[in-house]
Interface confidence: low
């Protein structure tokens, strides 16, 4: 038996038996070329909701160092540079896949792990709630 | 790289040529709930950069969906409704880790791999070129 | 205890149909993929069919494609092989088996059901 | 489709003998292959899974080894209840393929 594909010879994630354990490549291929975010573009400082980057680490993760979006302000940067307070800058987020050693310390061994990090920030209209 | 730590209770891998191939457990601890992302938040819509989702899928990878970012426009929205095209609306891209089933079709061995991704859109001054 | 009982087998003349049964007890049935595999009189063993928990992903050998259909109901614990256009290669005896849960070949099957396809 | 040649196809040995059998995949397979003992007229049993372990319930005196193309089953020392087929069976993708088996029978 096999755990069962959604695509001849794939196996499907949605039943409880797609297998538990696999073996994973960790030569990267990489399909881009990589490079530290602030070095990738200038977004982060001439966005209208600016962010500042901080470097997230832990030994215990592969990646070891995930970059984290924080806004700058509450709201957004106008054309004269003020911020208005009538806009907000949110963070945009994203769940990605990470590998987590378990048991811990152990080089051969991970478990797939989804964590949640904010990319960047965008800026939006604030939802009002009007009061009856 | 991963940093490696010495553990007796591990397998030895401080050859130079440290595992290419490691076991990951596929029961994905996640850390947050899961969410499409249309639904996680509407900062798609309310974005001065508004952006629509795409679903790109591979059964070949691990996610097998993924979704892509597409700004709008190429300028930004205005509190009029209207597109102030003395701005962009540019894409936040993010470099995350996907699994790719290696050799093609088979269940239990994949490659990691980088893939770049859109995760949502922001608003940036332009850069502009004077001519002398 | 793990049980799984075939039914349903018998004498079929070519082109005719017939649909096998396997009553599953013992675990959770809803929780593994099962299979049918097959083995022709004194001849080796052959797989027929693949249905996932959910029943969405079903695969089948090129040999019985477009004829032979698995199906499970996990309210009944059971897994069924709706044979149709049967053939004289079809004749063998008929196994259900339960896939592991981790996906690692076949851990139960069942006793076994008689196909005969002749005239 | 993945082919699995198993050899022998037959062989006679005695209660006690150390006995090999040989399974070769046409391609890559890893460590997804599984062992199984059949006797006459009864149903398949599950031996080895992953190449290498023993499923829950069956004898230490049988070993499974290999990855990649060749597998070995070995059975340390025979015993009376060991003569039967046994056959090895790839599950890395589809369609699931068997061996041809191979019959172990008393000298």
């Known amino acids: 038996g096999i755990a069962i594909p959604r695509n001849s010879g794939c196996p499907n994630s949605e039943d409880k038996n797609f297998p538990r354990t696999v073996m994973v490549n960790l030569n990267i291929h990489n399909r881009n070329t990589s490079t530290n975010p602030k070095r990738s573009s200038d977004y982060y400082n001439r966005s209208t909701s600016p962010w500042n980057l901080h470097r997230n680490e832990d030994p215990e993760r592969y990646p070891s160092v995930i970059w984290e979006a924080k806004c700058r302000h509450l709201g957004c940067v106008k054309a004269d540079g003020n911020v208005d307070y009538h806009m907000n800058s949110v963070p945009i987020q994203q769940e990605i896949l990470v590998l987590r050693r378990e048991p811990r310390h152990c080089p051969n061994s991970f478990r797939l792990e989804k964590i949640l990090v904010s990319v960047g920030c965008t800026c939006v209209t604030p939802i009002v709630h009007h009061v009856a | 790289g991963i940093a490696i730590p010495r553990n007796s209770g591990c397998p030895n891998s401080e050859d130079k040529n440290f595992p290419r191939t490691v076991m990951v457990n596929l029961n994905i601890h996640n850390r947050n709930t899961s969410t499409n992302p249309k639904r996680s938040s509407d900062y798609y819509n309310r974005s001065t950069s508004p952006w629509n989702l795409h679903r790109n899928e591979d059964p070949e990878r691990y996610p097998s969906v993924i979704w892509e970012a597409k700004c709008r426009h190429l300028g930004c929205v205005k509190a009029d409704g209207n597109v102030d095209y003395h701005m962009n609306s540019v894409p936040i891209q993010q470099e995350i880790l996907v699994l790719r089933r290696e050799p093609r079709h088979c269940p239990n061995s994949f490659r990691l791999e980088k893939i770049l991704v859109s995760v949502g859109c922001t608003c940036v001054t332009p850069i502009v070129h004077h001519v002398a | 205890e793990v049980q799984l009982v075939e039914s349903g087998g018998g004498l079929v003349h070519p082109g005719g149909s017939l649909r096998l049964s396997c009553a599953a007890s013992g675990f959770t049935f809803s929780s593994f993929n099962m299979d049918w595999v097959r083995q022709a009189p004194g001849k080796g063993l052959e797989w027929v069919s693949s249905?996932?928990?959910?029943?969405?992903?079903?695969y089948s050998a090129d040999s019985v494609k477009g004829r032979f259909t698995i199906s499970r109901d996990n309210a009944r614990n059971s897994l069924y092989l709706q044979m149709n256009s049967l053939r004289d290669e079809d004749t063998a005896v008929y196994y259900c088996?339960?896939?592991?849960?981790?996906?690692?070949?076949?851990?139960?099957w069942g006793q076994g059901t008689l196909v005969t396809v002749s005239s | 489709d993945i082919q699995m040649t198993q050899s022998p196809s037959s062989l006679s040995a005695s209660v006690g003998d150390r006995v090999t059998i040989t399974c070769r995949a046409s391609?890559?397979?890893?460590?997804?292959l599984a062992w199984y003992q059949q006797k006459p007229e009864k149903a398949p049993k599950s031996l080895i899974y992953?190449?290498?372990s023993l499923q829950s319930g069956v004898p230490s005196r049988f070993s499974g080894s290999g990855s990649g193309t060749d597998f070995t089953l070995t059975i340390s020392s025979l015993q009376p209840e060991d003569f039967a087929t046994y056959y090895c069976q790839q599950y890395n993708s589809y369609p699931l393929t068997f061996g041809g088996g191979t019959k172990v029978e008393i000298k």
């Open positions: 088996a339960r896939v592991s849960y981790y996906g690692h070949g076949f851990d139960y």
């Open positions: 249905i996932s928990t959910t029943s969405r992903i079903i």
């Open positions: 391609q890559g397979i890893s460590s997804w």
């Open positions: 992953a190449a290498s």
